[in-house]
Interface confidence: medium
């Protein structure tokens, strides 16, 4: 019989409230035997793989994703999946990451943790719709 | 080769229901693509009615579509549905569905059904 | 709802012409923009994905930019069988929308 897959689950480090030019690294975690992790922006506009994937603890595998300096089009609705073969995973939750005018500097503390995981299979079709895309920022070619 | 066959016409009287079939071969269809439903008016442009996971069931709708399409998938045949209910001559038109897959780091429709003509008339 | 503003509705161009059509989203640079070309009869056929990817198999006369929120198709030397209709679409924000098309003649 086929193996049921967990959700997996994403967070951000420092957190979701990012200062414009710092850094942020999304945390996706599975269960251990992920090849590919995927972190989706938006209502699945672009993605990002990577098969970089280490063993987080003895039951969970994380990747990394890292944006160096955050734009204000890098602020929107993230998520991940995985692939184990031979499937892929439901979604994570959505978790929103929001882009601030600087004040502090790229070292300033003033960042809210945060990680979005839960039962719910996917968001309702209507929790992401009125977020519109930030004024400038992401290119159309890259997730970020 | 992937491919998407849509059942075949309908001519129905307005109140009716009417189930269009999707069936994929050439891909796992339980594999991570979505299936989207689109609705093309006579010599109108294209309306996107909603989407389906097949992996689990879960939709997404447009909100003018809502209470009017239903969409359902049957794994063991690789099949999605359609349903609409309550026909009117507004809902005469092409429907398409189209498979969400996904390249070079984008998702997109980028394979069609040959399109089911619904007619309401009485 | 991100409104997908397309124009021109139709043109007319010669074979070997340069030929553009233009999307305009009301809101948002975050796009990811396709392109598809519908024959009479037919369903769309997928062009550009990303807004300025080539699908595979797509003749590479047919190229897409992007400037801000205007999207642009373009054809670089017009062929007989590119008479069709081609309408963008943008595939980021729910409800996914598409512009109101573009026919598109051979003088």
């Known amino acids: 019989q086929e193996e049921d897959l967990p959700r997996p689950s994403i967070s951000a480090e420092p957190g979701t409230v990012i200062p414009l030019g710092s850094h942020v690294t999304f945390v996706c975690r599975g269960p251990v035997g992920v090849q590919t992790f995927r972190l989706e922006r938006d209502s699945r506009s672009t993605y990002n793989d990577t098969e970089d994937v280490s063993q987080a603890s003895p039951s969970e595998s994380e990747a990394r994703f890292r944006i160096d300096s955050v734009r204000e089009g890098n602020a929107g609705l993230y998520r991940c999946i995985y692939y184990k073969p031979p499937k892929w995973s439901e979604q994570s939750d959505y978790l929103e990451l929001l882009v601030k005018e600087s004040s502090g500097g790229p070292d300033s503390p003033d960042t809210e943790p945060g990680s979005s995981a839960g039962p719910t299979q996917r968001p309702s079709d209507n929790s992401h719709n009125e977020h519109a895309p930030a004024s400038q920022g992401l290119k159309a070619e890259h997730l970020y | 080769e992937v491919q998407l066959q849509q059942s075949g016409p309908e001519v129905l009287k307005p109140g009716a229901s009417v189930k269009i079939s999707c069936k994929a071969s050439?891909?796992?269809?339980?594999?991570?693509?979505?299936m989207n439903w689109v609705k093309q008016s006579h010599g109108k442009s294209l309306e996107w009615i909603g989407y389906?996971?097949?992996?689990?069931?879960?939709?997404s709708y447009n909100q003018k579509f809502k209470g009017k399409a239903t969409l359902t998938v049957d794994k063991s045949s690789s099949t999605a549905y359609m349903e609409l209910r309550s026909l009117t001559s507004e809902d005469s038109a092409v429907y398409y569905c189209?498979?969400?897959?996904?390249?070079?780091?984008?998702?997109?429709?980028?394979?069609w059904g040959q399109g089911t003509s619904v007619t309401v008339s009485s | 709802d991100v409104q997908m503003i397309q124009s021109p509705s139709s043109l007319s161009a010669s074979l070997g012409d340069i030929v553009t059509m233009t999307c305009q989203a009301s809101?948002?640079?975050?796009?990811?923009l396709n392109w598809f070309q519908q024959k009479p009869g037919k369903a769309p056929k997928l062009l550009i994905y990303?807004?300025?990817n080539l699908e595979d198999g797509v003749p590479s006369r047919f190229s897409g930019s992007r400037y801000g929120t205007d999207f642009t198709l373009t054809i670089s030397s017009l062929e007989d069988e590119d008479m069709a209709t081609y309408f963008c679409?943008?595939?980021?924000?729910?409800?996914?929308?598409f512009g109101g098309g573009t026919k598109l003649e051979i003088k």
């Open positions: 809101q948002g640079t975050s796009i990811n």
């Open positions: 679409l943008q595939h980021t924000y729910l409800p996914y929308t």
């Open positions: 189209a498979r969400d897959g996904y390249s070079s780091n984008y998702y997109t429709m980028d394979y």
């Open positions: 389906i996971y097949p992996n689990n069931g879960a939709t």
């Open positions: 990303g807004a300025s």
């Open positions: 050439g891909y796992t269809f339980t594999d991570y693509y979505y």
